[in-house]
C-alpha cells in the first residue's frame, strides 16, 4: 500500500507559495499544512473554505481539533486520517460542507481519541456500512465516537444510489455494534420518510437524538424503550400526524426525556384522543402549548391542549355500497 508522508515547514499559518521541505520523516511538531492555520497551544488546525480536494497528509501530530469545512474533498478513502505517528490526540473532526459524496469503509480508522465527528451538509450518496466501524466483522472494536453529526447529508434525488437512503445511513450506524457508546446523534434535514425499527435499540447510550426537519409520518414501529439515558428527542418539522399509545407510554417511561414536537401536521380526529390526553398530563413535551392541528380543515390551527373528546371525531366509514368514487 502507499502511505501519506509529511511536509515540514516552520510557519504556523501556512502560506501556499512558501516552499516546504518535504521529507519521509515524521512531522515536526510545529508544522502546518499549506492553506491551513494552526495553533499548537489550542491544539487546533483549521483548513476552512480553502477548496482543498484532499485531506492534508502533513497534519501536525498534536492536533486535537481539526476543522476541514467548506472544501471539495469528494471522497474519504480508507485510512484518510491514518498517519505515522498516528493522530492520537484528534478528538473533534469537522468535515461539514466539504462536498463529500463518498465515505469509504475505515475512513476514520487509526483515530483512537475521536469523540466528535461532523459530516453535515455533504451530499453522501455513498456512505459505506463500515465507515464508522472500520471493519465488516459482526462485532467490531468499539468506536470512541460520542457525538455524530449527520445533518443534511442527503444527496440530490438524481445522485442517490438505487437503495434506501435511510437504510444506508442506518447500516453505517449499526455495523459491528461499534457505536454503542454514542451519546449524541443528529440526523436533521435528511428527508427521512421512516426510521428503521432496529436503529435506536442498538444505540443504548444515546442522550440526544435530533430527527428534526425530516419527513417522518409515523413512529409506530420505532421503539424508545431501551433509551433509558435519552434526554432530548427532536422531532420538530416532520410529517407526524399522531403519536399512538405505545409511543406515548414509552416516552413517558424515559426518566430524563424532553421531546420537541413543533411544526408537525397533526390530524385532530378520533385517533388523536389518546395523544391529547397525554399532552395534558405530561411534562416531557417542550412547548406543548404551541402544538396545533393541521387537519381536518375545520380543526386547522386549533391548539391541541385545548381540545376535548367531543372535538375529536372521525367521519363514519360508509359501507362500500354507499361510497362514491
Amino acid at each position: 500500500s502507499s502511505s501519506p508522508t509529511s511536509s515540514a515547514s516552520s510557519f504556523s499559518s501556512s502560506a501556499p507559495f512558501l516552499a516546504s521541505a518535504v521529507s519521509a520523516q515524521p512531522p515536526l511538531p510545529d508544522q502546518c499544512p499549506a492553506l491551513c492555520e494552526c495553533s499548537e497551544a489550542a491544539r487546533t488546525v483549521k483548513c476552512v473554505n480553502r477548496n482543498l480536494t484532499e485531506v492534508p497528509t502533513d497534519l501536525p501530530a498534536y492536533v486535537r481539533n481539526l476543522f476541514l469545512t467548506g472544501n471539495q474533498l469528494a471522497v474519504l478513502p480508507a485510512g484518510a486520517f491514518a498517519r505515522r505517528p498516528p493522530l492520537a490526540e484528534l478528538a473533534a473532526l469537522n468535515l461539514s460542507g466539504s462536498r463529500l459524496d463518498e465515505v469509504r469503509a475505515g475512513a476514520f480508522e487509526h483515530l483512537p481519541s475521536l469523540r466528535q465527528l461532523d459530516l453535515s451538509h455533504n451530499p453522501l450518496a455513498d456512505l459505506s456500512p463500515f465507515a464508522f466501524s472500520g471493519s465488516n466483522a459482526s462485532v467490531s472494536a468499539p468506536s470512541p465516537l460520542v457525538e455524530l453529526i449527520l445533518n443534511h447529508i442527503v444527496p440530490p434525488e438524481d445522485e442517490r444510489q438505487n437503495r434506501s437512503f435511510e437504510g444506508m445511513v442506518v447500516a453505517a450506524l449499526l455495523a459491528g455494534r461499534a457505536l454503542q457508546g454514542l451519546r449524541r446523534l443528529e440526523l436533521a434535514s435528511n428527508h427521512f420518510l421512516y426510521l428503521p425499527r432496529d436503529v435506536l435499540a442498538q444505540l443504548p447510550s444515546l442522550r440526544h437524538l435530533d430527527l428534526s426537519n425530516n419527513s417522518l409520518v409515523s413512529l409506530t414501529y420505532v421503539s424508545f424503550r431501551n433509551l433509558t439515558h435519552l434526554e432530548s428527542l427532536h422531532l420538530e418539522d416532520n410529517a407526524l400526524k399522531v403519536l399512538h399509545n405505545g409511543t406515548l407510554a414509552e416516552l413517558q417511561g424515559l426518566p430524563h426525556i424532553r421531546v420537541f414536537l413543533d411544526n408537525n401536521p397533526w390530524v385532530c380526529d378520533c385517533h388523536m384522543a389518546d395523544m391529547v390526553t397525554w399532552l395534558k398530563e405530561t411534562e416531557v413535551v417542550q412547548g406543548k402549548d404551541r402544538l396545533t392541528c393541521a387537519y381536518p380543515e375545520k380543526m386547522r390551527n386549533r391548539v391541541l391542549l385545548e381540545l376535548n373528546s367531543a372535538d375529536l371525531d372521525c367521519d363514519p366509514i360508509l359501507p362500500p355500497s354507499l361510497q362514491t368514487s
Epitope: S1, S2, P4, T5, S6, S7, S14, P16, A19, S20, V22, P33, A34, L35, C36, T53, E54, V55, P56, T57, D58, Q72, A74, V75, P77, A78
Partner: antibody, heavy 121, light 107 residues
C-alpha cells in the same frame, strides 16, 4: 506548447543518490497535482509518488517509501524526485505525469518523455 | 493493494478487426478505471478515463465499458497506428496500480 520534460537520469551505483527534475510549460503548473511513474526495461508501468498542487498531500508507493522524496516548486514550474539508497530494482525510465485535483478518481493526461535511471555496480 | 489483471497479455490482429481487451480489478473500483496506449520508446498516452470517457483527440473507434471489477477496452476497427501496448490503471485507491499490459501485434 503544453509539455513536461524530465532530466537528471543517469548511471548510479547501488546505495547512491540521484535527483530527477521535471520542467512543465504551456499550462498553469500550480493548479495540477503531479506524479512520478516508472517503467523498468521491458516491463509494465509502476506508479511511484504523488504530490498535490500545494504540497500538503503526498503519497508514495511502498517500494520507494523512506528512500524517495517528491517535491515541487510552483514558482519554477518544476517537479522533483530525490532518490536515495538506490537499488538495482529502481532501474527504469522515470516519467513525470500530470494528474487531476486529487490522487483518487483522477488520471494522467499529460506525460513527459521520460529519463532513464540505471542502478548498477 | 488493488491488483489489476489484463487479458490477454498479447494478441495478433489484422487491420479492420474488432479488438477487445479486458481488465479485472481484485476488488471493486467503481468506475475509476483509465486506459493508456504506449508505443515502443514513447511515453504512455491517455485514451479513456473513468471507464468510458474518451480523452480529447482520441479517435472514436476506441471505447470503454464496465464497472465494479470488470472492464473492457474495445477498438471497433483496428488501424495501422493502433498496434501498441495498452495498459489499464485504477484510481480508486492508493497505491495507484496498472495492469500488466496487452501487446497488440500485427497478424
Amino acid at each position: 506548447e503544453v509539455q513536461l520534460v524530465e532530466s537528471g537520469g543517469g548511471l548510479v551505483q547501488p546505495g547512491g543518490s540521484l535527483r530527477l527534475s521535471c520542467a512543465a510549460s504551456g499550462f498553469t503548473f500550480s493548479s495540477y497535482s503531479m506524479n512520478w511513474v516508472r517503467q523498468a526495461p521491458g516491463k509494465g508501468l509502476e506508479w511511484v509518488s504523488y504530490i498535490n498542487s500545494v504540497s500538503n498531500t503526498i503519497y508514495y508507493a511502498d517500494s520507494v517509501k523512506g528512500r524517495f522524496t517528491i517535491s515541487r516548486d510552483n514558482a519554477k514550474n518544476s517537479l522533483y524526485l530525490q532518490m536515495n539508497s538506490l537499488r538495482d530494482e529502481d532501474t527504469a525510465v522515470y516519467y513525470c505525469a500530470r494528474g487531476g485535483v486529487r490522487v483518487l478518481r483522477s488520471y494522467f493526461d499529460l506525460w513527459g518523455r521520460g529519463t532513464l535511471v540505471t542502478v548498477s555496480s | 493493494d488493488i491488483q489489476m489483471t489484463q487479458s490477454p497479455s498479447s494478441l495478433s490482429a489484422s487491420v479492420g478487426d474488432r479488438v477487445t481487451i479486458t481488465c479485472r480489478a481484485s476488488q471493486t473500483i467503481s468506475s475509476y478505471l483509465n486506459w493508456f496506449q504506449q508505443k515502443p520508446g514513447k511515453a504512455p498516452n491517455l485514451l479513456i478515463y473513468t471507464t468510458s470517457i474518451l480523452q480529447s483527440g482520441v479517435p472514436s473507434r476506441f471505447s470503454g465499458s464496465g464497472s465494479g471489477t470488470d472492464f473492457t477496452l474495445t477498438i471497433s476497427s483496428l488501424q495501422p497506428e493502433d498496434f501498441a501496448t495498452y495498459y489499464c490503471q485504477q484510481s480508486y485507491s492508493t497505491p495507484l496500480t496498472f495492469g500488466g499490459g496487452t501487446k497488440v501485434e500485427i497478424k
